[in-house]
Interface confidence: low
Amino acid sequence: MPNSEPASLLELFNSIATQGELVRSLKAGNASKDEIDSAVKMLVSLKMSYKAAAGEDYKADCPPGNPAPTSNHGPDATEAEEDFVDPWTVQTSSAKGIDYDKLIVRFGSSKIDKELINRIERATGQRPHHFLRRGIFFSHRDMNQVLDAYENKKPFYLYTGRGPSSEAMHVGHLIPFIFTKWLQDVFNVPLVIQMTDDEKYLWKDLTLDQAYSYAVENAKDIIACGFDINKTFIFSDLDYMGMSSGFYKNVVKIQKHVTFNQVKGIFGFTDSDCIGKISFPAIQAAPSFSNSFPQIFRDRTDIQCLIPCAIDQDPYFRMTRDVAPRIGYPKPALLHSTFFPALQGAQTKMSASDPNSSIFLTDTAKQIKTKVNKHAFSGGRDTIEEHRQFGGNCDVDVSFMYLTFFLEDDDKLEQIRKDYTSGAMLTGELKKALIEVLQPLIAEHQARRKEVTDEIVKEFMTPRKLSFDFQ
């Protein structure tokens, strides 16, 4: 992306989409009137620029150069129904959740298709994880390149992260880590996990000490997923940035090659945002480059990075991939996951601040049962008679969605889908099936977390050579 005003109509179009998302997220998040007004002003000005350049009004479903789809919605209606996704907000009006195929087109990524899944199976000699088989990880950038490297005995490494905003993590937060652990096991590669406590300090009303202590607490939950201590480095930005010149040098390089205008376009920053927020994307980008970790990779700059993350983190890494060749590094590859739906329905992602929107990793068996029974959005019918006659709707039923994430047995899941859709299984029975999966899952996690001593956390978070040799 050039270091100037949006160079093409398409960039302007994308900036409007992002700014529209920001406006909606500010409204949804009860932001101050000033913040909303300033964001709306910028949106209006971008739309005027677009109209001047394109000779027609901006329409959300009609990128420049594409014929407008036939629709009886006015532009405003269409725009309101568009899913929107950025690192802070996810919203959709559909009970089925985000339209991921549309998102792939909009983000310009590639679908994880059967062919790619088969290739992963061939390369690893392992059955693909159910997150791949079920389309939970659904999109990628350059995964074939990673497999090329792996098949040619060239190294790569994994990078994922967590924004530690509160001590309690929910089951949705485990998704990238469960999958990353599988990737680490089957490919036998190093892994770096970034705890963006600096980001949370900048965005939330927290002290630095609180942000750091959340990072350490969250690290215990991450470690409890079973990562190999000899192959995993977990780091807090607040901690590591000060002790790693390799990391900080890369942050500065990225900062030099990305303009304010670009981050404004990508992340929707406004003039009233603090400068810490504006420069933060460079910090999340830096771990994508191997020489940010000299203790692991020595001074090698050529080691490909693979980032498993939720699709809402893609804007950060689009920027990273854009800047990589300009500072002489390989572009990181990405694997994107779908969102983990809130208990109340797939329209939004779960929030750690709403206790009833989530199953927390600290919940007791009783709390899990109550939450699922009371709050899990149902695709069942209003009466037993209707349900028996017409069946339930698995596409919108949150208990079924959760089972697709956590019930590993494909046959059992398919049986449940058939029984629920046919009406043979009632909502209460579906919820019971989910409770029976979640209760031991959470109890086992809690038991493993109990085994994670402060000493172990310290070891995971100490910069050190991992059990790989990089010459």
């Epitope: 190999d228 201590i229 086992e444 085994e451 001593t453 000493e455």
Partner: antibody
């Protein structure tokens, strides 16, 4: 190299209590959980419970709650298990085992030599 | 509780033989399966952790495999010191549970 030295064999009367020890050396005692396991010819190996010497936190197999009490002496790097209200069912060999986390993915990597307890009148 | 079953309680083999000992869990244990060796004098050693990873100091003739509910331990070239009892143990969920053991005897 981690090494666990357990106390000697015990012959005790029914209804009495017994307290056995497991002295650790060769590693940082407070950094690793200590697990206890019972072995009998009839039931084989059974997990009793574990204690984290760093803060005294413990967890028990439901079956042994009220029967076994786990404690530690940090200064002497020693873990203890007390068994109360003994019956012939408690006659067994009891092992302590260090629980190593991380590269061994939750495994009891070093075991004591076992303490034999015989309950007899 | 998860039940661990070692169907073969004893097994006879000769020096140099290759033997496989199996273990079945009552539910999926996601590879959290460890193998232990107990010598006649009662000493217990960890051989293999997490299904297939060799504990430090364990000879490479020992190997493990499996997934889901079915796991096995293979000793490829039996030596005198390998005649002992072998136990499997699941570490996926509390309480940890063990198989009944397989005693490997000289033919």
């Amino acid at each position: 190299q981690a090494y666990l030295q357990q106390s000697g064999a015990e012959l005790v009367r029914p209804g009495a209590s017994v307290k056995m020890s497991c002295k650790a050396s060769g590693y940082t005692f407070t950094s690793y959980n200590m697990h206890w396991v019972k072995q009998t010819p009839r039931q084989g190996l059974e997990w009793i419970g574990a204690i984290y010497p760093g803060n005294g936190d413990s967890s028990y197999n439901q079956k042994f709650k009220g029967k076994a009490t786990l404690t530690v002496g940090k200064s002497s790097s020693t873990a203890y298990m007390q068994l109360s209200s003994l019956t012939s069912e408690d006659s067994a060999v009891y092992f302590c085992a260090r629980w190593h986390y991380g590269s061994t993915y939750y495994a009891m990597d070093y075991w004591g030599q076992g303490t034999s307890v015989t309950v007899s009148s | 509780d998860i039940q661990m079953t070692q169907t073969t309680s004893s097994l006879s083999a000769s020096l140099g033989d290759r033997v496989t000992i199996s273990c079945r869990a009552s539910q999926d244990i996601s590879n959290y399966l460890n193998w232990f060796q107990q010598k006649p004098d009662g000493t217990v050693k960890l051989l293999i952790y997490y299904t297939s990873r060799l504990h430090s100091g364990v000879p490479s003739r020992f190997s493990g495999s499996g997934s889901g509910t079915d796991y096995s331990l293979t000793i490829s070239n039996l030596e005198q010191e390998d005649f002992a009892t072998y136990f499997c143990q699941q570490g996926k969920t509390l309480p940890h549970t063990f198989g009944g053991g397989t005693k490997l005897e000289i033919k």
